[in-house]
Amino acid sequence: ATKLTEEKYELKEGQTLDVKCDYTLEKFASSQKAWQIIRDGEMPKTLACTERPSKNSHPVQVGRIILEDYHDHGLLRVRMVNLQVEDSGLYQCVIYQPPKEPHMLFDRIRLVVTKGFSGTPGSNENSTQNVYKIPPTTTKALCPLYTSPRTVTQAPPKSTADVSTPDSEINLTNVTDIIRVPVFN
């Protein structure tokens, strides 16, 4: 079995997480790809996904998450802008390949978002916080509702405008026009 590895990112509120997930070009270029959060004891939850089939270099924005699939480079770029403390958590990229299980891309991302000064060695304590604002999105994202054909206990969110639950670790504000459709039966 392949060892699950993760890379840790420590960022401050207002900053941007900007990461890449490499994939095999020939196999997965046009496959639909997704960005998921993994919470303890739960199945991974899809936060954003590319179109199906995935379009080359076409940004898909869901709230503060921007996905760009560079087919010619064999990488999915994920940006989470204007980070909030609640965004802290473990994330992963996956490739949907129904009816098979989603294919996970290495490595996982351990995101730690801190308020103000992090006090960690090597960080700059005097930096001004970036409060970059992004325009609201109009992108429609057709994400599979379930991350696994065996995951049938999760009910769809009541509102497409809020994909977070009251006790969730991530709060996706300004999420508009997300269409969630189950692709696994």
């Epitope: 890379e7 990461v19 997930c21 490499d22």
Partner: antibody, heavy 121, light 105 residues
Framework: QVQLVQSGAEVKKPGASVKVSCKAS????????IHWVRQAPGQGLEWMGW????????NYAQKFQGRVTMTRDTSISTAYMELSRLRSDDTAVYYC??????????????WGQGTLVTVSS | SYELTQPPSVSVSPGQTASITCSGD??????VSWYQLKPGQSPVLVIY???KRPSGIPERFSGSKSGNTATLTISGTQAMDEADYYC????????FGGGTKLTVL
């Protein structure tokens, strides 16, 4: 510790090709992108492209498309940058550099010592 | 194509604070890195992820970002800080700013 060691200086004639090598050590070669950056005399840093050693895939800056080829030999943890149809304005110091992390494209934390390529008739 | 704009030169007296700016479209959505380049040497990463210092970089180097402008600040500038400084970001491709020559008077 991570090290990138480049091949020695080259003198080439216009129209010729040059192939610069970059031998990596101290880490898993396949895990991190290798970038090539050059600096011409009196000019700034110019990104030429990246190589994904795992897949062998490369991404080139538009300016160098069709003239540059980036390859690797994983058995000896070495990346190569070949620039063809050389012109006098290709005279520069060429650097290889490695990504800081597997999951990012920038920044470049580790750099080779540089290879001076002189194009002169 | 994506461009990052830096002032060509900045002058500062020893012990004073030097500030070098870098601006670009949607830079607020991108992480900025800064490199120091001295003649005859390889570039050195001095700031990454907008404001983090790699180990071994003196505390007088700091980075910040406001909107679409990133700033490299060198507090208590020393003669040894005289060099060219480049900002960098990743758009579709990797982009360097034009560079700023820092002169310590």
């Amino acid at each position: 510790q991570v090290q990138l060691v480049q091949s020695g200086a080259e003198v080439k004639k216009p129209g010729a090709s040059v192939k610069v090598s970059c031998k990596a050590s101290g880490y898993t070669f396949n895990g991190y992108y290798i970038h090539w950056v050059r600096q011409a005399p009196g000019q700034g840093l110019e990104w030429m492209g990246w190589l994904n050693p795992n897949s062998g895939g490369a991404n080139y800056a538009q300016k160098f498309q069709g003239r540059v080829t980036m390859t690797r030999d994983t058995s000896i943890s070495t990346a190569y940058m070949e620039l063809s149809r050389l012109r006098s304005d290709d005279t520069a110091v060429y650097y290889c550099a490695r990504d800081q992390r597997k999951t990012t494209v920038t920044p470049f934390e580790y750099w080779g010592q540089g290879t001076l390529v002189t194009v002169s008739s | 194509s994506y461009e990052l704009t830096q002032p060509p030169s900045v002058s500062v007296s020893p012990g004073q604070t030097a500030s070098i700016t870098c601006s670009g479209d949607k830079l607020g959505e991108r992480q900025v890195s800064w490199y120091q380049l001295k003649p005859g040497q390889s570039p050195v990463l001095v700031i990454y992820q907008d404001n983090k210092r790699p180990s071994g970089i003196p505390e007088r180097f700091s980075g910040s970002k406001s909107g679409n402008t990133a700033t490299l600040t060198i507090s208590g500038t020393q003669a040894m800080d005289e060099a060219d400084y480049y900002c960098q970001a990743w758009d579709r491709n990797v982009v360097f700013g034009g560079g700023t020559k820092l002169t310590v008077l």
